[in-house]
């Protein structure tokens, strides 16, 4: 497969919030890339979000979806919004250089998202 | 138009060797991964190697039926890819195709191997 | 090494009839999964690639689903031209196993 590189770990934000980089080596020069996060969970894989780009233009994610991110060559800088306590897992980033043909496939090794819900503050009189 | 065309293919005794070439053209050859892939008489499609580009070092990857006996290599200044079949057994006989990640497929070639 | 169970191994169905084969994979293979159709005396012809993405100048009668270890190629309207040997097979990683191949024929 191609290779795709990927941290190891990432801790959430407070506010539930996590960044990381997918950077993948492509073999040739492709146009259009699609990046997919996968969620991995008691041997259970989940699509989290997808978002197909054409090289040289703005990564975009759905309307609704909890991804936003950035591209930059063969970089791909993710953010994966709304995350509780119960969302830590494992987050493979997948790529596939979908255009032109051949098509390449390339899957991360994971990066393993913590998430901390906060504390709720006291209430102060 | 993409082109492969293969060549090399013919009747070969039992221990014997083979050199299949693949000429590629259409296509931008360096920026791809190219296969050799075979059909033995009555059987279904059997993946035998691969041979990266150089952004992977020019990785080598083979089936556990050919590895140690085939060797593939390429030449990216004469678009063409090669597969050196050595110790041929009866059972290497079929069409021989290759192919650029698997998008691309050239017409193939027989190879028979027979006493 | 990843196996691939493809199934069945062949079938006979009439003109206009929605036909499927299906895959299966020994491990989760993300779908990387694309799919061929071999005529006599000819070469392989790439259908699917990716699980679900139609290759270039291929009828849209055929698509691909699934993801995972299950996989699925779908002929919706089989024609008379569709009478071929089809095969599955991981992209994913080294090897790249084919499944054994779904012979179709014409009632």
């Known amino acids: 497969a191609m290779h795709v590189a990927q941290p190891a770990v990432v801790l959430a934000s407070s506010r539930g919030i996590a960044s990381f980089v997918c950077e993948y080596a492509s073999p040739g020069k492709a146009t259009e890339v699609r990046v997919t996060v996968l969620r991995q969970a008691d041997s259970q894989v989940t699509e989290v979000c997808a978002a197909t780009y054409m090289m040289g233009n703005e990564l975009t994610f759905l309307d609704d979806s909890i991804c936003t991110g950035t591209s930059s060559g063969n970089q791909v800088n993710l953010t994966i919004q709304g995350l509780r306590a119960m969302d830590t897992g494992l987050y493979i980033c997948k790529v596939e250089l979908m255009y032109p043909p051949p098509y390449y496939l390339g899957i991360g090794n994971g990066t393993q998202i913590y998430v901390i819900d906060p504390e709720p503050c006291p209430d102060s009189d | 138009e993409v082109q492969l065309v293969e060549s090399g293919g013919g009747l070969v005794q039992p221990g014997g060797s083979i050199r299949l070439s693949c000429a590629a053209s259409g296509f931008t050859f360096s920026d791809n991964w190219m296969n050799w892939v075979r059909q033995a008489p009555g059987k279904g499609l059997e993946w035998l190697a691969q041979?990266?580009?150089?952004?992977?070092?020019?990785?080598?990857y083979y089936s556990a039926s050919v590895k140690g006996r085939f060797t593939i290599s390429r030449d990216d200044s004469k678009n063409s890819v090669y597969l050196q079949m050595n110790s041929l057994k009866t059972e290497d006989t079929g069409v021989y195709y290759c192919t650029a990640q698997f998008a691309y497929w050239g017409q193939g070639t027989l190879v028979t191997v027979s006493s | 090494d990843i196996q691939m169970t493809q199934s069945p191994s062949s079938l006979s169905a009439s003109v206009g009839d929605r036909v499927t084969i299906t895959c299966r994979t020994s491990e989760n293979i993300y779908g990387g999964l694309n799919w061929y159709q071999r005529k006599p005396g000819k070469s392989p012809k790439l259908l699917i690639y990716?699980?679900?993405n139609l290759a270039s100048g291929v009828s849209s009668r055929f698509s691909g689903s699934g993801s995972g270890t299950d996989y699925t190629l779908t002929i919706s309207s089989l024609q008379p031209e569709d009478v071929a040997t089809y095969y599955c097979?991981?992209?994913?990683?080294?090897?790249?196993?084919f499944g054994s191949g779904t012979k179709l024929e014409i009632k």
């Open positions: 041979i990266r580009n150089k952004p992977y070092n020019y990785e080598t």
């Open positions: 990716g699980a679900t």
């Open positions: 097979q991981n992209v994913l990683r080294s090897p790249f196993t």
